[in-house]
């Protein structure tokens, strides 16, 4: 039977009975927060073979192995993950081994096994046989391997029963427990699964099968399951569902959403039955089961009960995330904040229409209104006293409204008002009048020419670049020397630059008045020689990366009541030269016959240019006789068991420090001090652990139902 849409077993171990008839859990399985140690031996769920999402175990007292509970769990599909993980085993105080001896495939996601003080048999499992890439696995803070003495079946009797593989250059037996080997299929099967008798399954099978080369005998399917068969794609008139099976239209139409009872029901899109239309699509009518593409961002109407929504923090802006039409008025009052411009863009950047008025006052943190990057219509259905539908008052750092070269904004009804915006040039306001169609509506006092732009260099000249030179990590640029009417008014230049994959950046992107700026800034003093053109060498750049660069002249901004001239360049886009790529990732090699090696890898994380080919080199190496000289299984090698505390410590030194040559002298050696990079890595590691733990707690601790 298919169970779902996710099973959460907590507090009472007897809830496990819910799994009795499950063959597939369509969703996740949580077993957690069972604080009283119980005897789990009477609980066994041999029918369960597949979990389509993830398995999470957290603080289950008394549970020593998962093998008895889930002897036939074969596949965890990872269709949805828990913080990138398909298997999470966290703070399981009594777990001694994982023991999932039939687990053959984790289709997507990694594993996280952390803070399990008594957990052994971790180094004996070859996860690369189960997962595609093991680099994201996180196995930390469990019982130290040297205190485990993990022995695979038969090794004590010198009749080893398990097969060997190499992990981290260590060739060893692979097993789940003291009496269960890790199953490996013959190399002749390649990527295919195999039966218990090592016969290759049908290519559409995943994990295992009950008969060879038969797509009706699979334990789980590589692609999709329909009518008892593993199929590469769903047959006509059926639709992919939850990433593993095919369902018909009627089934899809009648699924009750687990998340909400008032949802509109599932939709069919692109051959899949899904909870809602994907990004960029909208239902073709409220009762429709089908999706159509949105023209631009998909509409989402948001309404404010009190008519006027005050945006005075990131938190208040968060309520507007995804909104494209705002029914009501916007009052923006942002006095301070961290990284405010990009946060506001994140939450308000999709708003296209405001039905009422927009008022921006005392927003000293704002440099630009470009965070409202899709605003195209202010209807002015409701207006402020004096018939204003766009009102901008006392914003000490506001320099730009929008980039009018790339912006169409219409104000359908009402007037504009601007006062006490000392860095906002009047020319910017006049430009807005023209674009928005409000020219002629304003009376003389509505746009104050004395207190708008009084502290800005409003008449800008254009600085022209004269030369650019690039290398793999440097850019050298020079520009014409700017000559204001009075040479003494020119103080220096500021060069702004940042990575720009696309040629669509503006000067005010990500900039606010509280110090946040997506641009890097470098000051350039005036060359003492009046005939030398100013310039700069930008270094420490990334190879084969496009940068946007512009230059501003820093001038004295006030000469009594005159607005003095400033100067800045256009934005220049320039790409650094290509360089040697970083190393290819996740290199794996396996032999599929006596004369062949199959080598796989992922592209480098930093291609530093357009990759055209890879070079694969190999050489024959002598067999390491050392592997055969030691008997790793003799009893005297087994260390005394000591219980770990489940915390993550630096490995203790249990022996006396070795005497070895160090710094040219004989004598006891101290550990080398950690490099900055190592310290940084440790800091990041600790941070990552905290983030995961917070995510775990936030996900699983929920208020008791009323």
């Amino acid at each position: 039977e298919i169970c779902g849409p996710g099973i959460d077993i907590r507090n009472d171990y007897q809830q496990l009975k819910r799994l009795e008839n499950c063959t597939v859990i369509e969703g996740y399985l949580h077993i957690l927060l069972i604080s009283k140690a119980e005897d789990y031996r009477s609980y066994r769920f041999p029918k369960l073979t597949v979990i389509t999402e993830y398995l999470l175990l957290f603080r289950v007292a008394g549970l020593e192995s998962l093998g008895d509970l889930f002897p036939n769990l074969t596949v965890i599909r990872g269709w949805k993950l828990f913080y990138n993980y398909a298997l999470v085993i966290f703070e399981m105080t009594n777990l001694k081994d994982i023991g999932l001896y039939n687990l053959r495939n984790i289709t997507r996601g990694a594993i996280r096994i952390e803070k399990n003080a008594d957990l052994c048999y971790l180094s004996t499992v070859d996860w690369s046989l189960i997962l595609d890439a093991v680099s994201n696995n996180y196995i930390v803070g469990n019982k130290p391997p040297k205190e485990c003495g993990d022995l695979c079946p038969g090794t004590m009797e010198e009749k080893p029963m398990c097969e060997k593989t190499t992990i981290n250059n260590e060739y060893n037996y692979r097993c789940w427990t003291t009496n269960r080997c890790q199953k490996m299929c013959p190399s002749t099967c390649g990527k295919r699964a195999c039966t218990e008798n090592n016969e290759c399954c049908h290519p559409e099978c995943l994990g295992s099968c009950s008969a060879p080369d038969n797509d009706t005998a699979c334990v789980a399917c590589r692609h999709y399951y329909y009518a008892g068969v593993c199929v590469p794609a769903c047959p006509p008139n059926t639709y992919r569902f939850e990433g593993w099976r095919c369902v018909d239209r009627d089934f899809c139409a009648n699924i009750l959403s687990a998340e909400s009872s008032d949802s509109e029901g599932f939709v069919i899109h692109d051959g899949e039955c899904m909870q809602e239309c994907p990004s960029g699509f909208i239902r073709n009518g409220s009762q429709s089961m089908y999706c159509i593409p949105c023209e631009g961002p998909c509409p989402k109407v948001c309404e404010e009960e009190k008519k006027t929504k005050t945006i005075d923090s990131v938190t208040s802006a968060q309520m507007l995330q995804g909104c494209t039409i705002f029914k009501g008025n916007l009052l923006i009052n942002i006095r301070r904040g961290n990284n405010i411009a990009s946060e506001l863009e994140n939450f308000m950047g999709l708003i296209e229409v405001v039905t009422g008025y927009v008022k921006i006052r005392h927003s000293h943190a704002l440099v630009s209104l470009s965070f409202l990057k899709n605003l195209r219509l202010i209807l002015g259905e409701e207006q402020l006293e004096g018939n204003y539908s766009f009102y901008v008052l006392d914003n000490q750092n506001l320099q730009q409204l929008w980039d009018w070269d790339h912006r169409n904004l219409t104000i359908k009804a009402g007037k504009m008002y601007f006062a006490f915006n000392p860095k906002l040039c009047v020319s910017e306001i006049y430009r807005m009048e023209e674009v928005t169609g409000t020219k002629g509506r304003q009376s003389k006092g509505d746009i104050n020419t004395r207190n708008n732009g009084e502290r800005a260099s409003c008449e800008s000249d254009v600085l022209h670049f004269t030369s650019t030179t690039t290398s793999k990590n440097r850019i050298i640029i020079t520009w014409h020397r700017y000559r204001p009417p009075d040479y003494r008014d020119l103080i220096s230049f500021t060069v702004y630059y940042k990575e720009a994959p696309f040629k669509n950046v503006t000067e005010y992107d990500g900039q606010d008045a509280c110090g946040s700026n997506s641009w890097n800034m470098v000051d350039v003093d005036l060359p003492p020689n009046k005939d030398v053109e100013p310039g700069i060498l930008l270094h420490g750049l990334k190879p084969w990366t496009q940068y946007a660069v512009y230059v501003k002249a820093v001038t004295l901004t006030m000469v009594e009541n005159d607005h003095i001239r400033g100067a800045k360049s256009e934005i220049l886009y320039i790409r650094t030269n290509a360089s040697v790529p970083s190393i290819p990732l996740d290199v794996l090699s396996a032999s599929n016959s006596s004369s062949q090696l199959i080598v796989k890898w992922n592209p480098p994380s930093l291609p530093n240019g357009n990759l055209s080919y890879y070079i694969v080199r190999w050489q024959r190496q002598p067999q390491d006789g050392y592997l055969y000289r030691h008997n790793y299984c003799s009893k005297d090698k087994i260390p005394i068991r000591k219980y770990a505390d489940g915390t993550i410590d630096i490995e203790e030194v249990t022996e006396n420090p070795k005497t070895e040559v160090c710094g040219g002298e004989k004598g006891p050696c101290c550990a080398c001090p950690k490099t900055e990079a190592e310290k940084q890595a440790e800091k990041e590691e600790a941070e990552y652990r905290k983030v995961f733990e917070n995510f775990l707690h936030n996900s699983i601790f929920v208020p008791r139902p009323e």
């Epitope: 068969v229 018909d248 009627d250 089934f251 009648n254």
Partner: antibody
């Protein structure tokens, strides 16, 4: 264990009506499509009707379309077949059957009831 | 509608024999064909689904093959309890249809 028990069969005159019921147990009834299949005396199997797990879709053989109505009550784990305008050729053993898979209505039937006899005779 | 024609309509065999029954569809049905066994006075029992899938609990001496329009049910090493009537059924499209049946009797 999974079980289906039909009831409601009997003798009825031509033109008359009858309602068959099928009580299900041992499985999640609402997850599976259900069917009625009949077998006239000494003849082969004939499919009559199928209803999806939710009850949202129904399918009928041409020979019964417009006269028979299949329905289900998922809260009672019961399947029904309302038979109106009965004819002599409707005389048969009527079996209710569970479809094998969950998620689609068109499938094979893996669990069958013991059958209930309907006789249409004047 | 898709017609299914079974042949032979009856077959005589002895315990231990190998018996093959065929089912031909009037149009392609991919592999969506099932086989049932029915004994007198009893309800049918599903043996094979999707042309070759062995239903759980069914002995492995029953096997199915074929796709498109031609399908076969094979019983190897016939046992006394296998004497019954066998039906094929298509699940490719509505209306669902059954073959007319093949009676397997003792020689």
């Amino acid at each position: 264990q999974v079980q289906l028990v039909e009831s409601g069969g009997g003798v009825v005159r031509p033109g008359g009506s009858l309602r068959l019921s099928c009580a299900a147990s041992g499985f999640t009834f609402s997850s599976y499509a259900m069917s009625w299949v009949r077998q006239a005396p000494g003849k082969g199997l004939e499919w009559v009707s199928t209803i999806s797990g939710s009850g949202g879709s129904t399918y009928y053989a041409d020979s019964v379309k417009g006269r028979f109505t299949i329905s289900r009550d998922n809260s009672k784990n019961t399947l029904y077949l309302q038979m109106n305008s009965l004819r002599a050729e409707d005389t048969a053993v009527y079996y209710c059957a569970k479809e094998r898979g969950s998620g689609w209505s068109l499938d094979n039937m893996d669990v069958w009831g013991q059958g209930t006899t309907v006789t249409v005779s004047s | 509608d898709i017609q299914l024609t079974q042949s032979p309509s009856s077959v005589s065999a002895s315990v231990g024999d190998r018996v093959t029954i065929t089912c031909r569809a009037s149009q392609g049905i991919s592999r969506w064909l099932a086989w049932y066994q029915q004994k007198p006075g009893k309800a049918p029992r599903l043996l094979i689904y999707a042309a070759s899938g062995l239903q759980s609990g069914v002995p492995s001496r029953f096997s199915g093959s074929g796709s498109g329009t031609d399908f076969t049910l094979t019983i190897s090493n016939l046992q006394p309890e296998d004497f019954a009537t066998y039906y094929c059924q298509q699940a490719s499209s509505f209306p669902i249809t059954f073959g007319q049946g093949t009676r397997l009797e003792t020689k």
